[in-house]
Interface confidence: low
């Protein structure tokens, strides 16, 4: 079952999935000036059997000006319904990605894809958070969020991460006025998770997935 909302946003933090549960959909979004080819799928779907999971369909974008070259389009409004976004760049690379049963890895980038990847997560998905450059974690706790089913509704658990500037007083979440989310709906937190395209993230994941260490490179 799809999660009803986006993962919570944490001020001055970004989130990332290490792997995507089967059933996850990724919208085939194209950057400005490009659109999805007419015969192309509107999304990629993580599917699998007992031994292997992979992304069905491929995203292809074509130049809005050109008629016959292969390449993709921003989904129509109906395709954007209940859209999920990581608001992280496609250039982001996940190093040493683990293989988890029933999960797909981060899909490789496609030509002329949009800078923002929009996922439709499913119940049971976990995403991990880290503070952005220039901010540090104010206190420890599970810096992750899991989409869970509660009372027949889906809800993301709340990551215990507060990111504060080295020279700033600590900011308690929610004291800023939240900004509108990319799709125009109010969001659950106050942060801007969109990052620049030179942001890269590497992860080292213990085999048990009990500990998750983010190492970030900025170039």
């Amino acid at each position: 079952e799809l999660c009803d909302d986006d993962p919570p946003k944490i001020t001055h933090a970004t989130f990332k999935a290490v792997a995507y549960k089967e059933g996850t959909m990724l919208n085939c979004e194209c950057k400005r000036g490009f659109r999805r080819i007419k015969s192309g799928s509107p999304y990629m779907l993580c599917t699998g059997n007992s031994s292997h999971s992979s992304w069905d369909n491929q995203c292809q974008c074509t130049s809005s000006a050109a008629r016959n070259t292969t390449k993709q389009v921003t989904p129509q409004p109906e395709e954007q319904k209940e859209r999920k976004t990581t608001e992280m760049q496609s250039q982001m690379q996940l190093a040493d990605q683990v293989s988890l049963p029933g999960h797909c890895r981060e899909p490789p980038p496609w030509e002329n894809e949009a800078t923002e990847r929009i996922y439709h997560f499913v119940v049971g998905q976990t995403v991990y958070y880290q503070c952005v450059q220039g901010y540090r974690a104010l206190h420890r706790g599970p810096a992750e969020s899991v989409c869970k089913m509660t009372h027949g509704k889906t809800r993301w658990t709340q990551p215990q991460l507060i990111c504060t500037g080295e020279t700033e007083p600590s900011q308690f979440p929610g004291e800023e006025e939240p900004q509108a989310s990319p799709d125009g709906l109010p969001e659950s937190e106050t942060s801007r998770l969109v990052t620049t395209t030179d942001f890269r993230i590497q992860t080292e994941v213990a085999a048990t997935m009990e500990t998750f260490i983010f190492t970030t490179e900025y170039q």
Partner: antibody, heavy 117, light 107 residues
């Protein structure tokens, strides 16, 4: 300054209805997780219902199907519609803002609901 | 549901005393715990979140510790305004649950 002010409590007979309101200032209700928490001498503090920014709602088992949480974004107000009230619903009802981590950082002053014949 | 049990249910102390209140969760909740102070006729007030993080504006004589199932709220030097009822609350999973409260009285 963040402020929450509840109203709408009172005496009602079993089976009756009440609508509680919580007027918020200093922040935007629609952009936050909002909850109703009630307090009774017997059961203590109990989370009754919550609604968060995406509009998802949830209810305690004891009130599901009878209570409805909602909000009016234009009035920056949270509501709790309580139907089929029972004696055990007698409590002080607080609206509270969730700090996004299931902690309640701001509370209203509370409004007393008494269900009695 | 996760049950939260506080002890003692009431405690008498004097101004200047160091007071400790404990809270035990029926299952592990990592550090997903908050402490609230409530005075008669008033709403609860958040003191500590994430087990040990002090809420903005709360005096530093309040501190929290613990992880997993056992947690402690400590008031290092009681002030007259600290006499109240204190509640713990787990924030790990739904339904969110509170302890039954510990009443701190003047000796």
């Amino acid at each position: 300054e963040v402020q929450l002010v509840e109203s709408g409590g009172g005496l009602v007979q079993p089976g009756g209805s009440l609508r509680l309101s919580c007027a918020a200032s200093g922040f935007t209700v629609s952009s936050n997780y909002m909850s109703w928490v009630r307090q009774t001498p017997g059961k203590g503090l109990e989370l009754v219902s919550f609604i968060y920014s995406g509009g998802i709602t949830s209810y305690a088992d004891s009130v599901r199907g009878r209570f409805t949480i909602s909000r009016d974004n234009s009035k920056n107000t949270l509501y709790l519609q309580m139907n089929s009230l029972r004696a055990e619903d007698t409590a002080v009802y607080y609206c509270a803002r969730d700090d996004y981590s299931n902690y309640f950082d701001y509370w209203g002053q509370g409004t007393l609901v008494t269900v009695s014949s | 549901d996760i049950q939260m049990t506080q002890s003692p249910s009431s405690v008498s102390a004097s101004v200047g005393d160091r007071v400790t209140i404990t809270c035990r969760a029926s299952q592990g909740i990592s550090n997903w715990l908050a402490w609230y102070q409530q005075k008669p006729g008033k709403a609860p007030k958040l003191l500590i979140f994430a087990a040990s993080s002090l809420q903005s504006g709360v005096p530093s004589r309040f501190s929290g510790s613990g992880s997993g199932t056992d947690f402690t709220l400590t008031i290092s030097s009681l002030q007259p305004e600290d006499f109240a009822t204190y509640y713990c609350q787990q924030a790990k999973s739904f339904p969110i649950t509170f302890g039954q409260g510990t009443r701190l009285e003047i000796k």
